[in-house]
């Protein structure tokens, strides 16, 4: 393919560059299902948006293969802890791929936030942030899970969120 | 506009791509004003820089509209806490826009770091990191606030910082 | 240089854009040396990759000068703490440059995670995340250090990691 072909590719690249895939999804009242599934997210209202990525049942769905910086923050908090000081929270980003039946761990954090609360009546807050670059194929999905999700605090979409952009 | 116009656009894009907006601002002795305003930042010395973004009174000012990954880290620490275990820190990134009189919360964390100080040692350290993608228009500003800012520790610009880049 | 030269530059840019430098390195059993050196990382297996960056003895080595978002997360944990409840952990990203004999601090966090354990036998978990934009020249290196590295917990490459991408 000669200069014309290259030209077309450049035009294409410029257009695609204008829509470099990116998304930022925010926490909402419906995020915590209690069903054992992943967290669900707001995709349109307020600060939430999807650009070159799609969404399905809690998952960011990749439409263009490549390397993505994916991230999530969850706001944790409570009055005391359901399991006392031994409570551990696992916050993770997981990949679903048609080529494998189980979710694959991508980025994970474990925290023991309740050591900050020394009695059952003590109010405490903590936050967990994850971010890193992973390769994702078209059709693959990324979800956020938190165990124990009873400790996730949602309010207005600014404290718990999930996003990605191609690098 | 024919190929020539497209060519100009591509040339323009290449030039602008060379200066994809980005900034990293660092904490300094003057960062904590105690006035209730946002944190102030170093913009030139050491690791700090501005490229395609400007700065005004603590704010990163957007010159080119688009989606930006914005981030901030603050180093927290102290000897004891002003309100004991009940002390809560709120660390947030906020948007100022000419179209709205009040600041808009973008990304926020709450932490109760003072449980990290124990009976045998009153000294404690903690850190709060925020990052996420938001859409910003030209002329809009982003600032960092920390409440209670008495618990922010500044030293050499590596522990508390604020930055952004276009995605 | 006329249009042809500009054309070549654009073609070159497109090609280089396809390999925008990026890397994600993961924690492994060999990461913790106990030698006082930086953490070592997996570069190929699982989620780890290098694209337009190289690796040498724990360091990401820059081949193309520019601004990079660099990041690292370490998973911390233990049963009690080696220095008691006063233990402080310093997690940092440091630059090595041929132009200067000592490592330069880029991004640093200090945490006192052991306050989360209320007795010497208490299991605790904590996590530290760092990320920020820095300018790196070709040949410069970035490493991760954790003091006290005895508190870093490695498992499967998802909990402790190190990465970068050009912005």
């Amino acid at each position: 393919d000669g200069p014309a072909g290259s030209w077309e590719q450049l035009i294409q690249e410029r257009r695609s560059h204008e829509v470099n895939p990116a998304a930022h999804l925010t926490g909402a009242n419906s995020s915590l299902t209690g069903s054992g599934g992943p967290l669900l997210w707001e995709t349109q209202l307020g600060l939430a948006f999807l650009r070159g990525l799609s969404y399905h049942d809690g998952a960011l769905v990749v439409t263009k293969a490549g390397y993505y910086y994916i991230y999530s923050k969850v706001q944790l908090g409570g009055v005391g802890c359901p399991l006392g000081l031994a409570s551990t929270i696992t916050h993770g980003l997981y990949k679903r791929t048609p080529r494998y039946p189980e979710e694959l761990e991508l980025l994970v954090s474990q925290q023991s936030p309740c050591g900050r609360a020394t009695s059952s009546s003590r109010v405490w807050w903590d936050s967990s942030f994850l971010g890193g670059v992973v390769h994702l194929e078209a059709g693959e999905e990324v979800v956020v899970r938190v165990l124990d999700e009873r400790l996730v605090r949602l309010r207005d979409g600014t404290r718990s969120y999930f996003g990605a952009f191609m690098v | 506009d024919g190929p020539a116009g497209s060519w100009e656009q591509l040339i323009q894009e290449r030039r602008s791509h060379e200066v994809n907006p980005a900034a990293h601002l660092t904490g300094a002795n003057s960062s904590l004003t105690g006035s209730g305003g946002p944190l102030l930042w170093e913009t030139q010395l050491g690791l700090a820089f501005l490229r395609g973004l400007s700065y005004h009174d603590g704010a990163l000012v957007v010159t080119k509209a688009g989606y930006y990954y914005i981030y901030s880290k603050v180093q927290l620490g102290g000897v004891g806490c002003p309100l004991g275990l009940a002390s809560t820190i709120t660390h947030g990134l906020y948007k100022r826009t000419p179209r709205y009189p009040e600041e808009l919360e973008l990304l926020v964390s709450q932490q109760s770091p003072c449980g990290r100080a124990t009976s045998s040692s009153r000294v404690w350290w903690d850190s709060s990191f925020l990052g996420g993608v938001v859409h910003l228009e030209a002329g809009e500003e982003v600032v960092v606030r920390v409440l209670d800012e008495r618990l922010v520790r500044l030293r050499d610009g590596t522990r508390s910082y604020f930055g952004a880049f276009m995605v | 240089d006329g249009p042809a030269g500009s054309w070549e530059q654009l073609i070159q840019e497109r090609r280089s854009h396809e390999v925008n430098p990026a890397a994600h390195l993961t924690g492994a059993n060999s990461s913790l040396t106990g030698s006082g050196g930086p953490l070592l990382w997996e570069t190929q297996l699982g989620l780890a990759f290098l694209r337009g960056l190289s690796y040498h003895d724990g360091a990401l080595v820059v081949t193309k000068a520019g601004y990079y978002y660099i990041y690292s997360k370490v998973q911390l944990g233990g049963v009690g703490c080696p220095l008691g409840l006063a233990s402080t952990i310093t997690h940092g990203l440091y630059k090595r440059t041929p132009r200067y004999p000592e490592e330069l601090e880029l991004l640093v966090s200090q945490q006192s995670p052991c306050g989360r354990a209320t007795s010497s036998s208490r299991v605790w978990w904590d996590s530290s995340f760092l990320g920020g934009v820095v300018h790196l020249e070709a040949g410069e290196e970035v490493v991760v250090r954790v003091l006290d590295e005895r508190l870093v917990r490695l498992r499967d490459g998802t909990r402790s990691y190190f990465g970068a991408f050009m912005v």
Epitope: - | V79, G80, C81, P82, L83, A86, R150 | -
Partner: antibody, heavy 119, light 111 residues
Framework: QVQLVQSGAEVKKPGASVKVSCKAS????????MNWVRKAPGQGLEWMGR????????NYNQKFMGRATFTVDRSTSTVYMELSSLRSEDTAVYYC????????????WGQGTLVTVSS | DIVMTQSPDSLAVSLGERATINCKAS??????????MNWYQQKPGQPPKLLIY???NLESGVPDRFSGSGSGTDFTLTISSLQAEDVAVYYC?????????FGQGTKVEIK
């Protein structure tokens, strides 16, 4: 202006208890720690502990653990220090001292309450 | 506990002359470049009064003839020009660690 007003002098027998009050005014009561310090005759100053009015959380000097109790009544902006199992060496002037804005010093003090323990 | 040792125990200085009181801690009272050391003045029949906090910061309303210096374990309170109203007992106090502890006090008199 900031004021800390303490209750009046007390005379107690060994083994008894005493409760000293400290009423605060002129500032936002819950925003500042309250410390208790005593000075025995011919001795120096001795820190007994602190209370956080916002939550009622307390930290005690180990020496007074189990004998001293600090409480707070937010409705009247008053803190209390109760010392039990009194002995003659507890004879002292007891002060409340407000934690400063940066909380690791005491910037305002009550006038003091003399507690005399004598059989 | 951190032991605070003041010297001298008493000090007689002429009016208008400099008075210097030293305080030594049994371990460092520094954290992140800040010294958790305070100085108080106590006159007979009165509560203590804060003069200096964080080793060298003058409390609001305190005359600037008072100054503090030092870091780590060694600290100094200086009265640059002694006035009659400065006759009192002066205490150093550390707040880096519980229990907060005071020095034994230094009595300042007029020579």
């Amino acid at each position: 202006q900031v004021q800390l007003v303490q209750s009046g002098a007390e005379v107690k027998k060994p083994g008894a208890s005493v409760k000293v009050s400290c009423k605060a005014s002129g500032y936002t009561f819950i925003d500042h720690i309250m410390n208790w310090v005593r000075k025995a005759p011919g001795q120096g100053l001795e820190w007994m502990g602190r209370i956080y009015p916002v939550s009622g959380e307390t930290n005690y000097n180990q020496k007074f653990m189990g004998r001293a109790t600090f409480t707070v009544d937010r409705s009247t902006s008053t803190v209390y220090m109760e010392l039990s199992s009194l002995r003659s060496e507890d004879t002292a002037v007891y002060y409340c001292g407000r934690g400063s804005y940066y909380w690791n010093a005491m910037d305002y003090w009550g006038q003091g309450t003399l507690v005399t323990v004598s059989s | 506990d951190i032991v605070m040792t003041q010297s001298p125990d008493s000090l007689a200085v002429s009016l208008g002359e400099r008075a210097t009181i030293n305080c030594k801690a049994s371990q460092s009272v520094d954290f992140d470049g800040e010294s958790y050391m305070n100085w108080y003045q106590q006159k007979p029949g009165q509560p203590p009064k804060l003069l200096i906090y964080s080793a060298s910061n003058l409390e609001s309303g305190v005359p600037d003839r008072f100054s503090g210096s030092g870091s780590g374990t060694d600290f100094t309170l200086t009265i640059s020009s002694l006035q009659a109203e400065d006759v009192a007992v002066y205490y150093c106090q550390q707040s880096i660690e519980d229990p907060w502890t005071f020095g034994q006090g230094t009595k300042v008199e007029i020579k």
